[in-house]
Interface confidence: medium
């Protein structure tokens, strides 16, 4: 851990992070903000990761300083340089890996003082489900599909008309390993669908929760999906 910045006479400044999750294979953001300084050259940002010897990222005197960067983060990190002056120290992490999960420290030095905050970063895979009428199956069947999840999620069906009903007996869920042998495709089928109803397919693991809704009436079928990351706590 690199801390050696005990400059006497400086106060502590407020640094805020938000626990977040990264979608493996995609780009992620480790969020961190601080009390801004008027001079960019006086701001130092250090990102550290518990258990990693080198730095994740360092920004000082208005530019990246990557001589101490750990090999596992080489070429994968960037701060939003134009937003540092307004107190944004967030880190962009490219091509998130499963091994990027862990505790990160956002360490800030400005002319006003120094401060730090930890951030729990989870990694996994999550994707929006799409619910469709399964026209290849018997006629009262819905199919919920989501291309990438990890760890293996739970899948639960619900309906607006039959609130509280347990659909486990009339649904079937399968998990198919994707080609990179980590993430899995989720497919869940719901049988005995009735008309004039809205059905929801809810997929959840410890990182994210996603819902695909389908509204079925005799004259139209409407779909929508949404996804929320879990455990987004500020510290």
């Amino acid at each position: 851990l690199i801390i050696g910045f005990g400059i006497s006479g400086r106060h502590s400044i407020t640094v805020t992070t938000v626990a977040s999750a990264g979608n493996i294979g995609e780009d992620g953001i480790l969020s961190c903000t601080f009390e801004p300084d008027i001079k960019l050259s006086d701001i130092v940002i250090q990102w550290l990761k518990e258990g990693v010897l080198g730095l994740v990222h360092e920004f000082k005197e208005g530019k990246d300083e990557l001589s101490e960067q750990d090999e596992m983060f080489r070429g994968r990190t960037a701060v939003f340089a134009d937003q540092v002056i307004v107190g944004n120290a967030s880190l962009r992490l490219k091509n998130v890996q499963l091994t990027d999960a862990g505790t990160y420290k956002c360490y800030i030095i400005t002319s006003k003082g120094k401060g730090n905050a930890n951030l729990e970063y989870k990694t996994g895979a999550f994707s929006m489900p799409e619910v469709n009428v399964d026209y290849n199956a018997s006629s009262e069947t819905l199919r919920c599909e989501a291309p990438r999840w990890f760890p293996q999620p739970t899948v639960v069906w619900a309906s607006q008309v039959d609130q509280g009903a347990n659909f486990s007996e009339v649904s079937n869920t399968s998990f198919e390993l994707n080609s990179e042998n980590v993430t899995m495709k989720v497919v869940s089928v719901l049988y005995n669908v009735t008309i004039n109803n809205t059905y929801s397919c809810m997929i959840e693991n410890d990182i994210a929760k996603a819902t695909g809704d389908i509204k079925v009436t005799e004259s139209e079928i409407k779909r929508r999906s949404h996804l929320q990351l879990l455990n987004s706590k500020a510290s």
Epitope: Y135, S139, E140, S219, E220
Partner: antibody, heavy 117, light 112 residues
């Protein structure tokens, strides 16, 4: 409003091919299957098959297998039906019809195909 | 394939009077999921077909309540309680229980 707009009438020679288009509007194209139905002059309706607009996978009725090809272009919400090796008994009106669960709830106006030497 | 047989072929009716069309299938239309996928369509002169009744007896949205469907297994009936001028056209029964989906030959309803 929901509608299916089909391409115009065609006159073809025996042995030729015809490709009929069906442009959907007013609803999310990939949420419904698209079917094709043949109606020969003064005759009833004959189901030719359908395409899953979501996956692009077609299913053909046995009587048309080998001569019919159903495709779709989701970017322009359009389904296509191509019939090859045309014969005189292919002279008919061809309808596209949206499948909602168990039935055809929206139909195109039909495309007349005349096969004549 | 399931053969759908309609009768009569032609049905001359008087305005305001009831009308009935029969449809028989060559095999049961009860699906393994216990539903019966028998539907009725009307094709007015020069137009494309439109859905009237789905799953034996369910009136499609916008269809007047003078139209009703009934039946089970292999025997089905479409009834019009009081025929109106706009009801003229060819009525088709259709099944979607078995692939390929098939239609009846049609019943032409005309005003006497």
């Amino acid at each position: 409003q929901v509608q299916l707009v089909q391409s115009g009438a065609e006159v073809k020679k025996p042995g030729a091919s015809v490709k009929v288009s069906c442009k959907a509007s007013g609803y999310p194209f990939t949420t419904y299957g698209m079917n094709w139905v043949k109606q020969a002059p003064g005759q009833g309706l004959e189901w030719m098959g359908w395409i899953d607009t979501y996956s692009g996978v077609p299913t053909y009725a046995d009587d048309f297998k080998g001569r019919v090809t159903m495709t779709r272009d989701t970017s322009i919400s359009t389904a296509y039906m191509e019939l090859s090796r045309l014969r005189s008994d292919d002279t008919a009106v061809y309808f596209c019809a949206r499948r909602s669960f168990w039935y055809f709830d929206v139909w195109g106006a039909g495309t007349t195909v005349t096969v004549s030497s | 394939d399931v053969v759908m047989t309609q009768s009569p072929l032609s049905l001359p009716v008087t305005l305001g009077q009831p009308a009935s069309i029969s449809c028989r299938s060559s095999q049961s239309l009860v699906h393994s999921n216990a539903n019966t996928y028998l539907h009725w369509y009307l094709q007015r002169p020069g137009q494309s077909p439109r859905l009237l009744i789905y799953k034996v007896s369910n009136r499609f949205s916008g269809v007047p309540d003078r139209f009703s469907g009934s039946g089970s297994g292999t025997d089905f009936t479409l009834k019009i309680s009081r025929v109106e001028a706009e009801d003229v056209g060819v009525y088709f029964c259709s099944q979607s229980t078995h692939v390929p989906w098939t239609f009846g030959g049609g019943t032409k309803v005309e005003i006497k």
